[in-house]
Interface confidence: medium
Amino acid sequence: MASMGLQVMGIALAVLGWLAVMLCCALPMWRVTAFIGSNIVTSQTIWEGLWMNCVVQSTGQMQCKVYDSLLALPQDLQAARALVIISIIVAALGVLLSVVGGKCTNCLEDESAKAKTMIVAGVVFLLAGLMVIVPVSWTAHNIIQDFYNPLVASGQKREMGASLYVGWAASGLLLLGGGLLCCNCPPRTDKPYSAKYSAARSAAASNYV
């Protein structure tokens, strides 16, 4: 019963992580550049995402623009987009596998097959988590590196956006969920009759001597 609770917990965390990856992918806040001038007319914040960028004025007014082409996206965000999309697809596969291998579903009759499917689902979630943590951490690394780079103009220094924090949370949930599912050990394959058979054999052997 404790094993089933662990399984439900693992699936729930992984599904939450999967949803968080989607949010991280959609939010246009991977990189944030604040141009806070001495004047409200020229104070604006630029949000850069995987699909669009937005300008937010000091008056709260916001305008977003979808990137015209893939080439309009900086290289690191191009790579991030690819990895995050793959992560979403991989995590979706993990969700499917966890439903098939769930203790409370009847997609598979064999308990051993169910347990193995669940371990595969766990590994898939772990992979999805790694696929999110890599681009998120790489983007954060670049931002931090530029922030402390004296050659980068202060007006061009970016800050970490909310999407990065959502991405880290998503990867944490996927890794935790996947880890719990991987702990889901398959049942022992020893059958009752085999135990009786080995006991009979040992008795026969002692009688022979």
């Epitope: 550049t33 001495s38 007319v41 020229t42 104070s43 604006q44 960028n53 008056t59 709260g60 990137y67």
Partner: antibody, heavy 119, light 110 residues
Framework: EVQLVESGGGLAQPKGSLKLSCAAS????????VSWVRQAPGKGLDLVAD??????????FYADSVKDRFTISRDDSQSMVYLQMDNLKTDDTALYYC??????????WGQGVMVTVSS | DIVLTQSPALAVSLGQRATISCRAS??????????MHWYQQKPGQQPKLLIY???NLASGIPARFSGSGSGTDFTLTINPVQADDIATYYC?????????FGEGTKLELK
Amino acid sequence: EVQLVESGGGLAQPKGSLKLSCAASGFDFDSYGVSWVRQAPGKGLDLVADISSKSYNYATFYADSVKDRFTISRDDSQSMVYLQMDNLKTDDTALYYCTVIAGGYLDYWGQGVMVTVSS
Amino acid sequence: DIVLTQSPALAVSLGQRATISCRASQSVSISGFNLMHWYQQKPGQQPKLLIYRASNLASGIPARFSGSGSGTDFTLTINPVQADDIATYYCQQSRESPPTFGEGTKLELK
């Protein structure tokens, strides 16, 4: 309908003072920044001063040419903006417009008030 | 300060296309957003916003007005020109403090 009505202009002596007022109506005044833009006779436009909304702590900006001489303020309860002009110079002679800052640009303009500095 | 350069005057015939240019002393674009705006001022009237962020038409402005450009070079196009469009046109940047205006381009009839 958005309306900005300026008042308080007129003739002033050099080193004298004037206080311009701008009465706003027809929009959510306390959410927007407001600026004063001037236009010398036959010349172009110059942003003189601006003031942000309460959410941005009423931050103010002054053009270098008026720093320490002009003071911008606002009264959200009355939907009013003021420009206190002290130590006036002949160069300050211009038509002064009250404008609403929408987002990097000046969305609405008043009719303007004339300020003449002459001895 | 960013200096905006406009030609002082432009003569056009009614029904023709008018192209008014504005050149900035440095780029006024950030991450694909062009922080240049256009105003129209008719004689004896206050200025009126026409175009914001280079290409967005302000509310109530007819579609014969359009804006384009990026970086340092921007254009306001009026096509076709009508008698009511005779005015002075100003560009303004909000990329850097202080915000600055161009000297204005006076649109005249040929």
